[in-house]
């Protein structure tokens, strides 16, 4: 799913107060719900009928440093007999994150948002065919 | 995929650099990357044979303001036949991503990370049938 | 290991109420859906109903719609199929089923027998 653009009130006060300085922002530290964790059920990766892979990119001026990108094993599924059926289409789900970058000049530290394109996992869809005259 | 702890290191300055006030750091405004757009398929979330629905959960003191939440349509998979077949599972593909929360007293603003589980799609998984004694 | 403990089996007259319940304990966190099965002699079990952990969505096969209602207590891990205005054609050995997504365990079943 796609973020829309930030608009330009998020980052403003109410229109009573004092402008801010055009172009930062004061960003607490700590994460909110920081505990919180997924429950996804183990190997789904493998026992999907669209199954896939995972490669983990690294950066240490990101959080999360660790980014993990799914990617489809198969271009069709995999059946009830476990042959791959070319007649349906294994699909990246792929969603719109944010991650902290950090930036530094000399002992200057900011932080910026950054979306991401993450591809998720797989799913089995069954394609629309065209005859194409 | 989940997000590990937030390291006390990354929004700190190098060692040689004067401390900075604790608790707070400096966010640019913008977001890096903002024009990046997911590409997935047309409706694969109805021709998936793990088909899902979308509800949207609005805020407007979060950065993305919408999140999309999907809820697989069914328990079992949907066969060629169009059918439901419950031998096969519907499972939900969740992802933890970042999103920005906006916090204000009176007319001072300031912004923290929280982390959000958003349930992304569904796919067909066989599952392993044991036998209970 | 996971345990299923199913329980309110028996004989009832057509008409009648039956109340089904089966409890899961050991590893039987994660859970996708819990459920119940049925099989006669001779045939294929078939579903009958099912109800999804994270939001209670329920599914039933269309011949006990309207007559079986089945529910779940999160905290005690327990699933209860509801079964009312009994008929013979009820009558058959029932399944508890929990669902881990990845992985299914059935339970050893309970015998129901409607009789006219």
């Known amino acids: 799913r796609k973020i829309p653009k930030v608009g330009h009130t998020f980052f403003q006060k109410p229109e009573s107060c004092p402008p801010v300085p055009e172009g930062s922002m004061k960003l607490d530290t700590g994460i909110i719900n920081e505990n919180q964790r997924v429950s996804m059920s183990r190997n789904i990766e493998s026992r999907s009928t669209s199954p896939w892979n995972y490669t983990v990119t690294w950066d240490p001026n990101r959080y999360p440093s660790e980014v993990v990108q799914a990617q489809c094993k198969h271009l069709g599924c995999i059946n009830a007999q476990g042959k791959e059926d070319i007649s349906m289409n294994s699909v990246p789900i792929q969603q719109e994150t944010l991650v902290l970058r950090r930036k530094h000049q000399g002992c200057s530290v900011s932080f910026q948002l950054e979306k991401v394109l993450v591809t998720v996992g797989c799913t089995c869809v069954t394609p629309v065919v065209h005859h194409v005259q | 995929r989940k997000i590990p702890k937030v390291g006390h290191t990354f929004f700190q300055k190098p060692e040689s650099c004067p401390p900075v006030p604790e608790g707070s750091m400096k966010l640019d405004t913008g977001i890096i990357n903002e024009n990046q757009r997911v590409s997935m398929s047309r409706n694969i979330e109805s021709r998936s044979t793990s088909p899902w629905n979308y509800t949207v959960t609005w805020d407007p003191n979060r950065y993305p303001s919408e999140v999309v939440q999907a809820q697989c349509k069914h328990l079992g998979c949907i066969n060629a036949q169009g059918k439901e077949d419950i031998s096969m599972n519907s499972v939900p593909i969740q992802q933890e991503t970042l999103v920005l929360r906006r916090k204000h007293q009176g007319c001072s603003v300031s912004f923290q990370l929280e982390k959000v589980l958003v349930t992304v799609g569904c796919t067909c998984v066989t599952p392993v049938v044991h036998h209970v004694q | 290991e996971v345990q299923l403990v199913e329980s309110g089996g028996g004989s009832v007259q057509a008409g009648d109420s039956l109340r089904l319940s089966c409890a899961a304990s050991?590893?039987?966190?994660?859970?996708?859906?819990f459920g119940w099965f049925r099989q006669t002699p001779g045939k294929e079990r078939e579903f009958v109903a099912g109800?999804?952990?994270?939001?209670?969505?329920?599914e039933y096969a269309n011949s006990v719609k309207g007559r079986f209602t089945i529910s779940r207590d999160n905290a005690k891990n327990t699933v209860d199929l509801q079964m009312d205005s009994l008929k013979p054609e009820d009558t058959a050995v029932y399944y508890c089923?929990?669902?881990?997504?990845?992985?299914?365990?059935w339970g050893q079943g309970t015998q129901v027998t409607v009789s006219s």
């Open positions: 050991g590893r039987a966190n994660s859970i996708n859906w």
């Open positions: 089923v929990l669902d881990l997504s990845t992985v299914r365990y």
């Open positions: 109800i999804r952990w994270s939001d209670a969505y329920t």
